[in-house]
């Protein structure tokens, strides 16, 4: 099985024990590590920040002692914006220039492939996204002709039904991608006005969301029905939780909220907590399991957080094995307890290790 793990470059800027550099990563933990994100500048792939090149070097030296590790560079992301990707993908010359710039950049900096993180193609971009993937793959094949190992091509895709329908021709893009990471998290957010888990495995009777699509099981099944081969589908598992501020004394699933949860001490983003911050939060909190959804949530005061723990990730791995998927994807290594100092287990990357162990179990 693949264990595809994202590392986010901005994690370096978190203060104190939250600061994570690539040399803190475990070279034997994941089969693939994806560095997020690269930029596109003047239609060429480029670093996002000047110090990225230093971090590329740190990441890729992990392969010195684990030659089986593969590293990919993810281009795009939320800050890049869909419009910029759209302009490049829809213009034949811009697309060509971008595609041509990728192999030398990846080779130079020691990467084994490219991950496309176009978040998200609009309805009019659907065909352009397919073309971009098809032409990128063709370039990778051509570039590998002189006996080089072919560069890998993957994409991170939304797990939301509405986005899947408008953005992706799943059957066509699957032909050209080496693997597809489906982002089976962020199904529920503060915009709903109520508490709810952002990454439930199943819908479950407790699901207060207004649709039956906002869960991992539906998203995976839908992708498979649309023509994604199970052998290329990698299922996303978050090492972060989504938090809410409760608006009343109600604390269950579907309780009214006044907004996102208070920012974490290190991640400093309202409504999001890294797993290592959740471990801190759990001291003195009340933990509940949403049985049907097979995921936990915790409450403390007026704060509510839905997250994944070692038990829930094992359930998710069992599920992906039952569906014969290619493996698991983790967002993100730097949100796990990468130092092993927060979650009281004297173990670095406890969630990712639990996923790895479950994938290896017979």
């Amino acid at each position: 099985y693949k264990l595809v793990c994202y590392y986010t470059s901005w994690s370096q800027y978190r203060e104190g024990d939250g600061s994570c550099f690539p040399d803190a990563l475990d070279r034997f933990l994941c089969t693939h590590i994806i560095y997020s994100f690269a930029n596109i500048s003047n239609d060429h792939i480029d670093t996002w920040e000047w110090n990225d090149v230093t971090l590329y070097g740190m990441l890729n030296t992990l392969k010195n002692r684990n030659p089986n590790l593969k590293t990919l560079l993810s281009v795009g992301g939320w800050n890049f914006g869909s419009q910029r990707f759209s302009k490049i993908a829809s213009n034949t010359q811009s697309r060509r220039t971008f595609i041509k710039s990728v192999p030398p950049f990846l080779r130079t900096h020691g990467f084994d492939g490219l991950d496309l993180a176009w978040l998200y193609p609009g309805r009019r971009d659907k065909q352009h996204f397919t073309t971009l993937i098809k032409e990128m793959k063709a370039e990778f094949i051509k570039e590998a002709q002189p006996g080089k190992k072919q560069l890998l091509l993957s994409a991170a895709l939304s797990a939301g039904k509405v986005t899947i329908d408008s953005s992706y021709d799943i059957a066509k893009i699957s032909q050209h991608l080496d693997f597809i990471s489906i982002m089976t998290y962020d199904f529920h957010g503060a915009w709903r006005g109520t508490t709810g888990h952002h990454s439930p495995l199943f819908r479950g009777q407790e699901d207060a969301s207004p649709d039956r699509f906002s869960n991992t099981d539906y998203a995976v099944g839908y992708m498979l029905r649309l023509g994604a081969p199970a052998s290329k589908l990698v299922m996303g598992i978050p090492t972060f939780g989504r938090s809410f501020t409760l608006a009343s004394s109600e604390t269950g699933v579907g309780a009214p909220i006044s907004g996102p949860g208070i920012p974490g001490r290190f991640t400093k983003e309202a409504g999001t907590l890294a797993y290592y911050e959740i471990c801190d939060f759990l001291r003195g909190a009340t933990v509940h399991r949403i049985l049907g959804q097979q995921v936990p949530y915790a409450t403390k005061g007026n704060q509510w957080v839905g997250y994944d723990d070692q038990e829930s990730v094992k359930s998710k791995v069992q599920y992906l094995k039952d569906r014969q998927l290619a493996g698991a994807m983790v967002w993100a290594l730097d949100l796990d307890d990468f130092q092993g100092s927060f979650c009281g287990q004297d173990l670095r990357f406890p969630l990712t290790n639990a996923i790895k162990d479950a994938l290896a179990a017979t």
């Epitope: 003047n42 060429h44 670093t47 110090n51 230093t54 950049f105």
Partner: antibody, heavy 117, light 107 residues
Framework: EVQLVESGGGLVQPGGSLRLSCAAS????????MHWVRQAPGKGLEWVSA????????YYADSVKGRFTISRDNSKNTLYLQMNSLRAEDTAVYYC??????????WGQGTLVTVSS | DIQMTQSPSSLSASVGDRVTITCRAS??????LNWYQQKPGKAPKLLIY???SLQSGVPSRFSGSGSGTDFTLTISSLQPEDFATYYC?????????FGQGTKVEIK
Amino acid sequence: EVQLVESGGGLVQPGGSLRLSCAASGFTFSSYAMHWVRQAPGKGLEWVSAISSSSGTIYYADSVKGRFTISRDNSKNTLYLQMNSLRAEDTAVYYCAKDFGAVFDYWGQGTLVTVSS
Amino acid sequence: DIQMTQSPSSLSASVGDRVTITCRASQSISRYLNWYQQKPGKAPKLLIYAASSLQSGVPSRFSGSGSGTDFTLTISSLQPEDFATYYCQQSSSTPWTFGQGTKVEIK
């Protein structure tokens, strides 16, 4: 083997112009940002300017902003520094350096620019 | 701009000595601190990047440590070829700035 060879230095009068070149070899020039760093005689190092791999991002030290222009030609594996309105305090050895994330991992041998009347 | 201050500005040492040079940033620069060696008439050479990562080909007697504002370059056993001037440089934010240098001389 990475090689950076600067040229174009020399004696110039205050207010004059010079264009420095840096010929690069031994690495994929088009995939790396590049820098100019200078060193006045008997003094320390001062970063001057930087240009990203695709020329999309350019930075200058305040001391040269508006007077110096950095550029590159990826097809020729060459980095340039156009220096206008030169002053006596611009007298220095100018080094081009390969970027390793705002770390200067390879340097040329330098070219001396003397601004004097 | 971030100011980098090295100390001492010069030091005399003998072959075999353990030598320590410090560098202080005027504000936190995380691990974005690099060390260079320069010999007279030559270009600088990168020794250490990201505070503690040894550049390829650099002898292991050179090591770096520190984070935030205070950093150290250590030469565990000074060799004849190590007599030179050493500069620290921050790569945290533009303009990228250097310390004023530390000259290591033969005692």
